[in-house]
């Protein structure tokens, strides 16, 4: 496989990563599918610092991150440990409302103005952020 | 000059199988997200696949989800769309696509000439 | 998923005159919208991209309008290399999908 030394064209690197910040609303699923094209995945959260550092970039704006609870338990899309790992919830949230009339509760998790966390609908068009850590080899699979 | 050359079509009977190659030059193959687009005879396009440019993360319409797989080989410069179970609805010409390269805009920049895959018995 | 419809199937133009394609989203795609081109035998060409983005090397005479579900190309003086199919695609939202056409041919 390959290995990424430096960040692509309009990705912004921090502590080893790159990121890249969406200017445009895309439903959780979609932004998913974006970050993923682009071998990286909706921005994990695992420290107070790089919550600053994201918050600073998107500015007062709700955005996308890399954690949902579609199957159940709270997960981020990286298999990085939920329990046990950073969270920076706003009060009383997650709190799964139903009361959005939109059907279904609330399984996808965006910064707020505020930075602080919420849970809300998925296919709310929000910005996002993609993630990709350097110096990782890219597994490209074996071709049968 | 960006060039797109596919190859492998042809005739297969209801439930073979076909393996479609495209061959890439004139950029950075490994830095793009590649796709495959059909279309079949006197009709519109349909999108069918797509692949990272590390070939770690694939995604598939869900016409042809199960059955067709697209890989990549970086080394190579090509892409490739291994065709199973085959039905009379997979007719088409199959165009490989390069993405557009901006985060977000899944449209296609590049396209090859296309390969035909006729399935009938 | 979302269905993109296009207006008019045919488009029957003079050379010289101006055309203008619809395409219709059925659920807004934002200005996540491309216009190709496609010729008898040939692949689609990119156009368009944003919606009204020309892509590189497209001549000025081409040129796309709208967000949200309504879109138009403008082609704003046909010539002959002109008359061919053009097709709409989102990215909005995955699966991307395509419209069916519009073929321009000569009045």
């Known amino acids: 496989g390959s290995e990424r030394t430096c960040c692509p064209v309009n990705w912004v690197e921090h502590e080893r990563s790159c990121y890249w910040f969406s200017r445009s609303g895309k439903a959780w699923a979609d932004a998913d599918n974006y970050c993923r094209l682009e071998d990286a995945h909706l921005v994990v959260v695992t420290s107070w610092e790089e919550q600053k550092f994201v918050q600073h970039h998107i500015g007062p704006v709700n955005t996308w991150m890399g954690l949902h609870d579609q199957n159940g338990p709270w997960k981020w899309v990286d298999g990085t440990d939920y329990e046990t790992g950073f969270k920076n919830w706003r009060p009383e949230q997650p709190d799964d409302w139903y009361g959005h009339g939109l059907g279904g509760g609330e399984d996808c998790a965006h910064f707020t103005d505020d930075g602080r966390w919420n849970d809300d609908v998925c296919q709310r068009p929000y910005r996002w952020v993609c993630e990709t850590e350097l110096d990782k080899a890219s597994q490209e699979p074996p071709l049968l | 000059e960006v060039q797109l050359l596919e190859s492998g079509g042809g005739l297969v009977q209801p439930g073979g199988s076909l393996r479609l190659s495209c061959a890439a030059s004139?950029?950075?193959?490994?830095?793009?997200?590649m796709s495959w687009v059909r279309q079949a005879p006197g009709k519109g396009l349909e999108w069918v696949s797509a692949?990272?440019?590390?070939?770690?993360?694939?995604f598939y319409a869900d016409s042809v989800k199960g059955r067709f797989t697209i890989s990549r080989d970086n080394s190579k410069n090509t892409l490739y769309l291994q065709m199973n179970s085959l039905r009379a609805e997979d007719t088409a010409v199959y165009y490989c696509?390069?993405?557009?390269?901006?985060?977000?805009?899944?449209?296609?920049?590049?396209w090859g000439q296309g390969t035909l895959v006729t399935v009938s018995s | 998923e979302i269905v993109m419809t296009q207006s008019p199937a045919i488009l029957s133009v003079f050379p010289g005159e101006r055309a203008t394609l619809s395409c219709r989203a059925s659920?807004?795609?934002?200005?996540?919208l491309a216009w190709y081109q496609q010729k008898p035998g040939q692949a689609p060409r990119l156009l368009i991209y944003?919606?009204?983005t020309r892509a590189t090397g497209m001549p000025a005479r081409f040129s796309g309008g709208g967000s949200g579900t309504e879109f138009t190309l403008t082609i704003s003086s046909l010539q002959s290399e002109h008359f061919a199919v053009y097709y709409c695609?989102?990215?909005?939202?995955?699966?991307?999908?395509f419209g069916p056409g519009t073929k321009v041919d000569i009045k």
């Open positions: 696509a390069k993405f557009f390269g901006v985060v977000g805009v899944g449209c296609f920049d590049y």
């Open positions: 004139g950029f950075t193959f490994s830095s793009y997200a």
């Open positions: 692949i990272s440019g590390s070939g770690g993360n694939t």
């Open positions: 659920q807004s795609v934002s200005s996540d």
């Open positions: 944003g919606a009204s």
């Open positions: 695609q989102q990215y909005s939202n995955w699966p991307f999908t």
